[in-house]
Interface confidence: low
């Protein structure tokens, strides 16, 4: 059987939701000694990076300028050490946002509810779309989808303190092209600690797990530098 290297990890730097015309950055974390990394888009070769020096770096960044709907979709990456190629990474969905229009998000029965109450979010967008998405800030990987012509509802069921936080919605023109985000709606669940909108388990900045933590070999130790990335609070 053909020998392959372990699959790399693909991540979006900062976020996988990129406003149109902005730059997207994807990180491919493979192995020290990899001489070439390839970024694939919808199954086809999109870009190539060759780290220098390869033995000192365990991954690369791919910069995708001028984000638009043609560049939104499924990305993966592979790497090569000598003549040996890795398995393909998992797929990463890169989304372009700020397309066309802005939806309105509301919550019923209201933004201040009691633990155990049933809550429903409503996302409304007057331009033609059929899919709506609801995201909780700091939890943007947990996307809820709902369908409707102009408005979609997101029933949350009986809420607990884990539901508190700030929510936004998007209209989706296809899986990878989303509207501008709605204004945030803050859900407060009575019984929570005073004046707190984010659950204690929420990260202090959104999508912190999407940060590119590439490492540089510095002699005897690995320096866990954030490699020209600055976390935003």
């Amino acid at each position: 059987p053909k020998q392959t290297l372990p699959k790399p990890i693909i991540r979006a730097e900062s976020t996988y939701m990129v406003p149109k015309e902005k730059q997207a950055t994807l990180c491919c974390q493979g192995s020290y000694g990899a001489v070439e990394y390839q970024l694939h888009f919808e199954g086809s070769l999109f870009a190539v990076e060759r780290p220098k020096p390869p033995e000192r770096i365990n991954g690369v960044k791919f910069h995708i300028p001028d984000m638009n709907s043609r560049k939104a979709g499924r990305y993966s990456c592979i790497y090569r050490v000598g003549e040996l190629w890795s398995e393909r990474s998992d797929l990463l969905d890169l989304v372009v946002t700020e397309m066309y229009d802005t939806p309105t998000l509301s919550v019923h029965p209201g933004p201040e509810v009691t633990s155990g109450e049933k809550v429903t979010f409503y996302c409304r967008l007057d331009t033609a779309t059929s899919m709506f998405l609801l995201l909780k800030e700091g939890r943007s990987r947990d996307v809820q989808r709902s369908y409707g012509k102009v408005q979609a509802e997101f029933p949350m069921g009986p809420v607990t303190t884990a539901h508190r936080g700030s929510y936004r919605c998007f209209g989706s023109y296809n899986n990878y092209a989303w509207s501008f985000p709605s204004e945030p709606v803050k859900l407060l669940v009575t019984g929570d600690i005073e004046n707190t909108s984010l659950a204690p388990t929420d990260p202090t900045f959104p999508d912190s797990w999407d940060t590119c933590l590439l490492t540089r070999e510095t002699g005897l130790q690995k320096d866990l530098a954030l490699w020209d990335h600055t976390a935003q609070n």
């Epitope: 029965p109 009691t114 109450e117 049933k118 029933p155 407060l188 009575t190």
Partner: antibody, heavy 116, light 107 residues
Amino acid sequence: QVQLVQSGAEVKKPGSSVKVSCKASGYTFSEYTMHWVRQAPGQGLEWIGGISPNIGGTSYNQKFKGRATITADKSTSTAYMELSSLRSEDTAVYYCARRGGSFDYWGQGTTVTVSS
Amino acid sequence: EIVMTQSPATLSVSPGERATLSCRASQSISDYLHWYQQKPGQAPRLLIKYASQSISGIPARFSGSGSGTDFTLTISSLEPEDFAVYYCQNGHSFPLTFGQGTKLEIK
């Protein structure tokens, strides 16, 4: 058991204010919103507004905004509803009600009579 | 605001018979609909929450159904103590609104 005990009946002159209290017991006061509903003689129920004692957030029926003020004192587990610029049509029974989605517990009601 | 309309205004039924009360919302409220019973000189009492969920301590003869804009409260076999005024309530959107009430009287 859950109990909501309201203050006694009031007779007020037009233009004056009234403040009705509602003392809660039998549950954690800060975990439920407290609302006020009124009922004029022979009429139906009308929502005035509510408060989240935990965060102090209030929500009002637009009809009463500016005239009604709802407050809560967590230390005494008491909610208050003050209605100003009273007129004869404010004559009603005023109820406090705990809201856990629905109004699951109600006070006994406070009769407010506005008469010159 | 969401307007709640109850019908009929008065319903005359004999004890032991079935009573059906209706409530209509001016726009969809999913199942955020609650029913209350009120007797003269008393505060309202919660009977049914979220259109069909029963309440502890409320007799099983009271049941609710409906979703969206049309809702029904059914009392399967009327007892003398059931004659009262019944209100439906929108729990979906602020301002919270009530129907005008249905008076259930003895025939």
